[in-house]
Every structure is written in structure tokens, then in C-alpha cells.
């Protein structure tokens, strides 16, 4: 799987997830977040050569063909396959609440 | 929606659906495909600037972190999101067979 | 500049809903919380609620509760409020406001505001 | 719900004098969870002062504000023609936010 378990630890041109820190305050101007300061969301990237992680029939068919035609530019993308929520603290004044945000790191990646 | 309705009616530079026709024989070397003999697979291209057609929270903070930060190379990618199946005709023998794959035709795309 | 036009003035028969939308410019509109305060005569100022872009967290005033609804659409830089079930007492000019950035805190930039008038 | 008492709820004063409007809070808001805006007839608020005693950009200098607790003042150092408005003060510091009912005030 391309996750972190397997691409933090390898040099893996190909599709993989990549680490990725955001300070909330610095990178998205998200002052209201008052813990964390930021996280790691990750992000993914890579080449998706044929059958790599593919994540549906139409993929691995555009990753044929790009093998079969070198000069096409229509080739599979590497993108966010797992995610999970990040958990924040803000302040409602001076109330301090807990909110789960969804969808907020990549664990692992796909080639789609 | 980034549709076939929308995308192959205007010349969209960003994320769009693009037209690609696949000839089963030439382009894939799938010589047990009878009928068709080929089918437009489509496929997903162009940037995917700030906010368009965002699928997660991730990738709509991926987004946002690129506006802010325009030298990251982090950036979402723009991928299939509605995928719809092709009828074929094949041959078993001499005894014809239907059969129905799914996730052949992109019908729309998405930035994620 | 930060500009933030609001839908222009409505009317509204009570037990009714009314929707006003808040187009911003000029600024990272996903980076900023948004406001919603009313006006009137009798009342004066009173807040609303507010909601984040982006995750979609909305605050709202225990009064307004059950009967407001705060969106934002991040894909048009556009905030929305709806408030339903109409009375009499809801006749106001309706603004948005942009916050310094807290959840609660000072409005720096305000919307021209909306008239909504409830009559039967 | 924090209550706001603003005094006096009108005044009149000339050109060059030194005006104070008071903001009195229900419960203690602490040293910065306070605003103070202006709004003129027809047109919409302007934030002058936030955290108690932070001047907006493009406030003008003579605007400033102070206090603590419970409460607050803003202060106008010398009085312009164009200051005639409306102050309301506004506390964040618990939900409901709540403005006070305003001071009005006039030039001679």
C-alpha cells in the first residue's frame, strides 16, 4: 500500500504520500485554531506508471495505454486515497471547544 | 459539475474532463474485444486552481495552502469522479458473450 | 479591497424563511470567520452567529437557535444565512461582518446590510 | 448573557473639546475582549477600537480606548465635526457577543 507506513520510509519516485507540515496560522491564515499550532496533512505526488496502485478499471486502462503510446499526456494522477480527521481547539470567547475536522490528513495515496 | 456537458463545450484550461478515444486493437493490444472497436475512455487534465471542484477538506486546504504559499509543490490533481461502464461483445469459442466493465467512461472529474 | 455586498432588501410574510447571501472580496475569504448581526430600532445590535468557512463550523446565539441556519460556499466566496419561521419582531437590517479572525472577536469589515421586513 | 450599559446615551459637545463615553459589562471581560464602533446615519458601523485599546487601521489618533473588567472608556481627544455618529461598544469575550445600546453624539 502507499501509505506512510511503506513511502516515509523508502525513496519512492513513483506515486507515494509525502510529508507535509501546515501551520495554521502561517500557511492557511486560520487564526481562530488554537491547538495544534499546525499538522501533518501530507500530500500526494509521483508518477503513476501502469498498474501502480490503480484505483479503478478506467486507470489502468489510461495507464495501458499511456504505456503502449509514450507520447500521450493523458496518464493517471496520484491522489489522496485514506484520510482521517485531524481533532482541534478553539476558543468561542473565552470557551474552549473540541471540533473533529474530517478529511484532514493523507495516510495513503492511489493512482486514479 | 465538470462534466462532459460543461467540458466539451468550452475550451477550459483548468480541470475538465478531455475527450480520448481508445481503439481496443491499436492502442491496447486487446485483440478479444469484438464490439466496439473502440470507445471514448475520456480522462482528466488541468490545473486545479484554489477551490475548483474541490472532493475534500483536504484538498480544499491543499488548495488554500498553495494560494498562500505559491512556491509549494504540493498542489491537488485532477482526477475522475462520476465513471460510468462499457457494454462489450466478446467471443468464448464461437459462442458470443456480453459483458459489462465497470469504471470504463469519465464523465466527470474532480480536484482532489 | 475587502469588499463584502450583501442580497439587496426583502419581504417576507411571518412563518416564512428568508435566505441573504454575503459575496466577499478582496481577501482570503476561507481564512476569515463570518458574522451575522441584525439591526433594529428597538433592539439595537444584536449578533446572530457565526460560521467558518471551509470546515463549516457555525456558532450561533441561543435565541436564533433551531430557526437559523449560517452556510458558507467557499467555491463563490459567499456566505448565507437563513433564518426561518418569520415573525414580526424579525423586521431588521441584516449585516455581515468580517471577524479580526477568532471564532468571537471584533467585525473589522461589514456588508452594506439587507432590510428585511416581516408583514403579513 | 453579558449585559452592555453604555453612558451617557447622548451627548453634545464643540468641536476641539474632549469627549469619554463609559461601557459598563455584567461580568468581568478581562483586559481585551472589547470593541468600540462608530456608525453614522444610513451608513454601517466602523470598528475604531478592538482589545480594549487597539486602534483600528485608519483610525485616526485621536480616537483611543482603555479599561478592564467591567469597565471601559473611549476616549476623543479633541473633537472633529466629522465625529458626529453613534458609538456602540461590543464584548466578545463569552457568546453571545453583545453591543450596548449606544451613545449619541452631537456637535455643537
Known amino acids: 500500500a502507499l501509505d506512510t507506513n511503506y513511502c516515509f520510509r523508502n525513496l519512492e519516485e513513483n506515486c507515494c504520500v509525502r510529508p507535509l507540515y501546515i501551520d495554521f496560522r502561517q500557511d492557511l491564515g486560520w487564526k481562530w485554531v488554537h491547538e495544534p499550532k499546525g499538522y501533518y496533512a501530507n500530500f500526494c505526488s509521483g508518477p503513476c506508471p501502469y498498474l501502480r496502485s490503480a484505483d479503478t478499471t478506467h486507470s489502468t486502462v489510461l495507464g495501458l495505454y499511456n504505456t503502449l503510446n509514450p507520447e500521450a499526456s493523458a496518464s493517471p494522477c496520484c491522489v489522496p486515497q485514506d484520510l482521517e480527521p485531524l481533532t482541534i481547539l478553539y476558543y468561542v470567547g473565552r470557551t474552549p471547544k473540541v471540533e473533529q475536522l474530517s478529511n484532514m490528513v493523507v495516510k495513503s495515496c492511489k493512482c486514479s | 459539475a465538470l462534466d462532459t456537458n460543461y467540458c466539451f463545450r468550452n475550451l477550459e484550461e483548468n480541470c475538465c474532463v478531455r475527450p480520448l478515444y481508445i481503439d481496443f486493437r491499436q492502442d491496447l493490444g486487446w485483440k478479444w474485444v469484438h464490439e466496439p472497436k473502440g470507445y471514448y475512455a475520456n480522462f482528466c487534465s488541468g490545473p486545479c486552481p484554489y477551490l475548483r471542484s474541490a472532493d475534500t477538506t483536504h484538498s480544499t486546504v491543499l488548495g488554500l495552502y498553495n494560494t498562500l504559499n505559491p512556491e509549494a509543490s504540493a498542489s491537488p490533481c485532477c482526477v475522475p469522479q462520476d465513471l460510468e461502464p462499457l457494454t462489450i461483445l466478446y467471443y468464448v469459442g464461437r459462442t458470443p458473450k456480453v459483458e459489462q466493465l465497470s469504471n470504463m467512461v469519465v464523465k466527470s472529474c474532480k480536484c482532489s | 479591497q475587502v469588499l463584502l455586498v450583501q442580497s439587496g432588501a426583502d419581504v417576507r410574510k411571518p412563518g416564512a424563511s428568508v435566505k441573504i447571501f454575503c459575496k466577499a472580496s478582496?481577501?482570503?475569504?476561507?481564512?476569515?470567520?463570518m458574522h451575522w448581526v441584525r439591526q433594529t430600532p428597538a433592539q439595537g445590535f444584536e449578533w446572530m452567529g457565526s460560521?467558518?468557512?471551509?470546515?463549516?463550523?457555525?456558532t450561533y446565539a441561543r435565541r436564533f437557535q433551531g430557526r437559523l441556519v449560517l452556510t458558507a460556499d467557499t467555491s463563490t466566496n459567499t456566505a448565507y444565512m437563513e433564518l426561518r419561521s418569520l415573525k414580526s419582531a424579525d423586521t431588521a437590517v441584516y449585516y455581515c461582518?468580517?471577524?479580526?479572525?477568532?471564532?468571537?472577536?471584533?467585525?473589522?469589515?461589514w456588508g452594506q446590510g439587507s432590510l428585511v421586513t416581516v408583514s403579513s | 448573557e453579558i449585559q452592555m450599559t453604555q453612558s451617557p446615551s447622548s451627548l453634545s459637545a464643540s468641536p476641539g473639546d474632549r469627549v469619554t463615553i463609559t461601557c459598563r459589562a455584567s461580568?468581568?471581560?478581562?483586559?481585551?475582549?472589547l470593541a468600540w464602533y462608530q456608525q453614522k446615519p444610513g451608513k454601517v458601523p466602523k470598528l475604531l477600537i478592538y482589545?480594549?485599546?487597539s486602534r483600528a487601521p485608519g483610525v485616526p489618533s485621536r480616537f483611543s480606548g482603555s479599561g478592564s473588567g467591567t469597565d471601559f472608556t473611549l476616549t476623543i481627544s479633541s473633537l472633529e465635526p466629522e465625529d458626529a455618529a453613534t458609538y456602540y461598544c461590543?464584548?466578545?469575550?463569552?457568546?453571545?457577543?453583545?453591543f450596548g445600546q449606544g451613545t449619541k453624539l452631537e456637535i455643537k
Open positions: 461582518a468580517r471577524t479580526l479572525g477568532l471564532v468571537l472577536d471584533a467585525m473589522d469589515y
Open positions: 460560521v467558518i468557512p471551509i470546515v463549516d463550523i457555525a
Open positions: 478582496g481577501y482570503t475569504f476561507s481564512s476569515n470567520v
Open positions: 461580568q468581568s471581560l478581562g483586559s481585551s475582549y
Open positions: 482589545g480594549a485599546s
Open positions: 461590543q464584548q466578545y469575550a463569552d457568546s453571545p457577543i453583545t
